[in-house]
Amino acid sequence: KNLKSPQKVEVDIIDDNFILRWNRSDESVGNVTFSFDYQKTGMDNWIKLSGCQNITSTKCNFSSLKLNVYEEIKLRIRAEKENTSSWYEVDSFTPFRKAQIGPPEVHLEAEDKAIVIHISPGTKDSVMWALDGLSFTYSLVIWKNSSGVEERIENIYSRHKIYKLSPETTYCLKVKAALLTSWKIGVYSPVHCIKTTVENELPPPENIEVSVQNQNYVLKWDYTYANMTFQVQWLHAFLKRNPGNHLYKWKQIPDCENVKTTQCVFPQNVFQKGIYLLRVQASDGNNTSFWSEEIKFDTEIQAFLLPPVFNIRSLSDSFHIYIGAPKQSGNTPVIQDYPLIYEIIFWENTSNAERKIIEKKTDVTVPNLKPLTVYCVKARAHTMDEKLNKSSVFSDAVCEKTKPGNTSK
């Protein structure tokens, strides 16, 4: 009896795993084996496909074959017993185009009100994604184990932190990868569940802000309790995309280790130009808080956001204030790349009652002043970009006396 060639051959490629599946064409014939050949583009000869010779099942793995994943290949299969069937040719394909992204590896760390998610590709040093490894983005689905109501989070990187969760609650999530450059969406990871911890009696520090004073950065934060020590760590923001990078490590700011105040001052030259993440942790000697929410810190923006420099022209009932670019060391003005808004505070020298003016212009009139009275003025700059939302520190106060009133009234 003539053997029929197998039919319906499917090629499944997930990461670097190449799997072939097919249907037997004649179930009644026993002890049949199957063999594959492959052919590269531009070649006439067929080569035996290692890993897929004399197979008794209807599945084989040819992952060990070192293929150029961007090069088209063709496969053929035949059945063998005493004699052989005719070859059945599979449509040619390019492995990279056919490949799916496998489930990523996921590691979770629980806090009381947050979960840290570390994601890495399921196949280490994948050949398939060798040119795209840093282009992976991820999306996840998370739900409370008790409710099952799903929340989707798109376009996250290899490390992501979900805040505003409930303590002592089990959350479950699954993650999949995507290569947006190649229009590829991956397979979900298995479901991972983790229980948030009991509430930490020490909350994390809040409202972290960076400002510039002289040649230093001043980092400030709020904290609920007194008599604490704090530590501050930094990380290059771009590393969030690639924790596989050996540089991915939160590092201490030396001048902000074990500080006993809710601020620390460190030289600007600690950081080269770039975008960083900063986080703060509190300790009372026995217990330690979880890390604060991370803030993004752009040295370019911070450096330019120095307090404004201004001149005052005094009249009898008003001040004219002319705002100029702040000076760096060496008295060179800082070039302003960002639109700014100015906050001007003024008060009578003998009083604490402050009044405020907010202006986009660099020449401002402060009206309704009393003649022959000393008024003090200080100013600061704010970025108008909502995303950045940065403020300089206030300039030093400048005090001037108004001119005598017009006596010929």
């Epitope: 590691h107 760390e109 629980a110 009696e201 490590k249 939160w250 026995n286």
Partner: antibody, heavy 123, light 107 residues
Framework: QVQLVQSGAEVKKPGASVKVSCKAS????????MNWVRQAPGQGLEWMGK????????HFNQKFRDRVTLTVDKSTSTVYMELSSLRSEDTAVYYC????????????????WGQGTLVTVSS | DIQMTQSPSSLSASVGDRVTITCKSS??????LAWYQQKPGNAPKLLIS???TLESGVPSRFSGSGSGKDYTLTISSLQPEDFATYYC?????????FGQGTKLEIK
């Protein structure tokens, strides 16, 4: 598969130093903390310290801070633990053990252990 | 330093028994707790991390529970190979500290 292979047993005199090695294989050496734990005969486990193989950052148990030195040879994926000013109570089995990924926000459990190195301090 | 107190320090049980070992920390350790099994002449082996997560390859008869300062290791049905010494360890604060161990012996 992950393997940590330690150097052989040592006999030392009081006041001397001992240097134990731990060669790692089967994973990215510079991506995980390496810890050292000791166990005196018939006693429990005691954490000594840990090192980041990528930049040699160290953390120590205060008890050992002045006597222990942790070093790394990245070219051979080996970590060394040197204990100085040995006394008889330092007689113990010394283990290296892999800790969490350096990129983790918090410390992790010790998931792979070396076979241990017995250090005997005796005059 | 955080103190870890394990109880009991020794325990006799039979194959098939359900066994529970407890571990108390002097401070809250936020589930940063591991359980290890050690057999004579061998290095410790990690069984459970994060208080509840079973390491791959560890039989499902082992389970961990607890939160805050109180944690438990349970072996649902003792097997002959489970007779060993068990240690808990906190890794919330440095220095990491271990319990004094629980020796599980055949009755």
């Amino acid at each position: 598969q992950v393997q940590l292979v330690q150097s052989g047993a040592e006999v030392k005199k009081p006041g001397a130093s001992v240097k134990v090695s731990c060669k790692a294989s089967g994973y990215t050496f510079t991506s995980y903390w390496m810890n050292w734990v000791r166990q005196a005969p018939g006693q429990g486990l005691e954490w000594m310290g840990k090192i980041d193989p990528s930049d040699s950052e160290t953390h120590f148990n205060q008890k050992f801070r002045d006597r222990v030195t942790l070093t790394v040879d990245k070219s051979t994926s080996t970590v060394y633990m040197e204990l100085s000013s040995l006394r008889s109570e330092d007689t113990a089995v010394y283990y290296c053990a892999r800790g969490g990924r350096i990129s983790f926000d918090y410390d992790a459990a010790l998931d792979y252990w070396g076979q241990g190195t017995l250090v005997t301090v005796s005059s | 330093d955080i103190q870890m107190t394990q109880s009991p320090s020794s325990l006799s049980a039979s194959v098939g028994d359900r066994v529970t070992i407890t571990c108390k920390s002097s401070e809250v350790i936020y589930n940063r707790l591991a359980w290890y099994q050690q057999k004579p002449g061998n290095a410790p082996k990690l069984l459970i991390s994060g208080a509840t997560t079973l390491e791959s390859g560890v039989p499902s008869r082992f389970s961990g529970s607890g939160s805050g300062k109180d944690y438990t290791l349970t072996i649902s049905s003792l097997q002959p190979e489970d007779f060993a010494t068990y240690y808990c360890q906190q890794y919330w604060n440095k220095p990491f500290t271990f319990g004094q161990g629980t020796k599980l012996e055949i009755k």
